[in-house]
């Protein structure tokens, strides 16, 4: 089996141009594309990785919200050769949910990394973002936190950082089959520099206050109110959005494609990757642009172009 | 129908600079990657720089590193060339070229960008 | 001196079957990197011919088919036409040069 093969971080290393080709080894039945789409209310980037994979032809298709951060994952297994490129991998510069500037700002301010490396997005190298809401939802907590794609025996993983609904929430996390989006929010000025190492503790309530040893003989004086505090992982609210569409046909035979229009042939998964039987639409992987229509996310609104190169 | 409309060639003296712009039409320019492709009088086709959809993503031939400028404007559906510093191996009609399927599937008509004394 | 190398030019009549080669190195074509192949007649702009080593896109006749394999690549134009009379160059991702590349092209002439 010949596959396509390639990495993407945000924008770059599936893009045109750079598409490989591989021969899987033995037992290998088929290709594989995954791709990953974050999008905060400053913007949106994607996660990818084609090559040649495990498990059962088929197609899944899955939204989540984190807080109000949306991701949007799909995954896609064929087993022809060079059948593994028709996910959309590009999206569109982020109208930011619609017209930023129309937006009035909230008063909380957060660091944004939408799209960058790991090395950009160290502690207070990223751009500063003035949060706003959106849709009737209020962002005025800070996130920090990764996406990570695991497909095809590669990890690929961004860090994330913007605005988010809540302002405390803890190493939360939101799961699709291979993809992970987690991490943890905080409330005030830039104060999602570094997050990895946030407690479970929330401020509401007192954390276990270690008093040290008595220094004189005297009878120890117990804290007031010292009931032992232990630390429990509220758990974790997953919304899972999942979309199935009907599958286009695709009439074209594979040596005459139209560069303009590439139809995606349906397949519905038994069991398989993720378990959904839905298949992917054209278009998704940039999920919907406008913030207002949350019950659409995600819809097509997203980048429609084969695999790069407009529509 | 896409269409790809190049401006801003002429005349201009070694050391120079001139500014090449691209309106394109008919797709969603925003998700295309872009590039610049070069052909001197009478050569062949040698690619100059490149960009991603959202313009973070950029790359440069070596010819060209450092004195040429790729950048866009989506709102605009307009891609630009900014040319300093040029030299008389810089003469050479220039093309816009949008990433399609892994390759340039649609060129514009050129501008012819001419460096002489 | 071009990445990847073609011959500079190549000639058949009218009917015949020509083909034009394209050899690279392990920093593009041999590293996995797909071709493609532009045809540029007189006076005009370049016009994607095949993609992906051997797709068409839609509106190129089947008389042309590409192929791939190791570090090189060839276009075959089969029942050649007077108006195939053309430049034609192929193109591949370069690691080393972070960037596609170009070959030299093939000045394609038809006889009679």
């Known amino acids: 089996l010949e596959c396509y093969s390639c990495v993407q971080k945000a924008d770059d290393g599936c893009s045109p141009h750079r598409m490989k080709t591989v021969k899987c080894g033995p037992g290998v039945d088929v290709c594989t594309e995954a791709v990953g789409a974050v999008e905060t209310i400053h913007g949106q980037f994607s996660v990818a990785v084609r090559g040649c994979g495990s498990g059962i032809p088929g197609k899944n298709d899955r939204g989540l919200d984190l807080h109000g951060l949306l991701a949007f994952f799909q995954l896609q297994q064929c087993s022809e050769d060079r059948c593994n490129a028709k996910l959309n991998l590009t999206l569109r510069g982020l109208n930011p949910a619609g017209n930023e500037s129309a937006y009035e700002p909230n008063g909380a301010e957060c660091y944004s990394c939408v799209g960058l490396s790991r090395e950009k997005c160290q502690g207070s190298m990223p751009p500063v973002v003035n949060c706003y809401n959106a849709s009737g939802r209020v962002y005025k907590g800070c996130f920090d936190g990764n996406v990570t794609l695991t497909a095809a025996n590669v990890t690929v993983s961004l860090p994330v950082r913007g605005c988010v609904q809540d302002e405390t929430c803890t190493r939360d996390g939101v799961t699709g089959p291979g993809f992970t989006l987690s991490g943890s929010c905080c409330q005030g000025p830039r104060c999602n520099a570094d997050l990895r190492n946030k407690t479970y503790f929330s401020p509401r309530i007192p954390p276990l206050v270690l008093l040290p040893p008595p220094t004189t003989a005297a009878p120890s004086t117990r804290a007031q109110n010292s009931s032992s505090t232990t630390s429990t992982a509220a758990p974790t609210t997953t919304t899972s959005i999942i979309k199935p569409t009907t599958a286009q046909a695709s009439h074209t035979s594979p040596h005459e494609m139209d560069l303009e229009v590439i139809q995606e042939e349906g397949a519905s998964l038994s069991g398989g990757a993720a378990g959904h039987g839905g298949t992917a639409g054209h278009g998704g992987a940039a999920g919907h642009q406008d913030r207002s229509n949350m019950e659409k996310y995600p819809g097509k609104g997203g980048a429609q172009i084969p695999a790069k190169g407009g529509s | 129908e896409v269409q790809l409309l190049e401006s801003g060639g002429g005349l201009v003296q070694p050391g120079g600079s001139l500014r090449l712009s691209c309106a394109a039409s008919?797709?969603?320019?925003?998700?295309?990657?872009m590039s610049w492709v070069r052909q001197a009088p009478g050569k062949g086709l040698e690619w100059v720089s490149y960009?991603?959809?959202?313009?973070?993503?950029?790359y440069y031939a070596d010819s060209v590193k450092g004195r040429f400028t790729i950048s866009r404007d989506n709102s605009k559906n307009t891609l630009y060339l900014q040319m300093n510093s040029l030299r008389a191996e810089d003469t050479a009609v220039y093309y816009c070229?949008?990433?399609?399927?892994?390759?340039?599937?649609?060129w514009g008509q050129g501008t012819l960008v001419t460096v002489t004394s | 001196q071009s990445v990847l190398t073609q011959p500079p030019s190549a000639s058949g009549t009218p009917g015949q079957r020509v083909t034009i080669s394209c050899t690279g190195s392990s920093s593009n074509i041999g590293a996995g990197y797909v071709v493609h192949w532009y045809q540029q007649l007189p006076g005009t702009a370049p016009k994607l011919l095949i993609y992906?080593?051997?797709k068409r896109p839609s509106g190129v006749p089947d008389r042309f088919s590409g192929s791939k394999s190791g570090t090189s690549a060839s276009l075959a134009i089969s029942g050649l036409r007077s108006e195939d009379e053309a430049d034609y160059y192929c193109a591949a991702w370069d690691d080393r040069l972070n960037g596609p590349v170009f070959g030299g092209g093939t000045k394609l002439t038809v006889l009679g």
């Open positions: 992906d080593n051997n």
């Open positions: 960009i991603s959809s959202s313009g973070s993503t950029i």
């Open positions: 008919g797709f969603t320019f925003s998700n295309a990657w």
């Open positions: 070229a949008r990433e399609g399927l892994w390759a340039f599937d649609k």
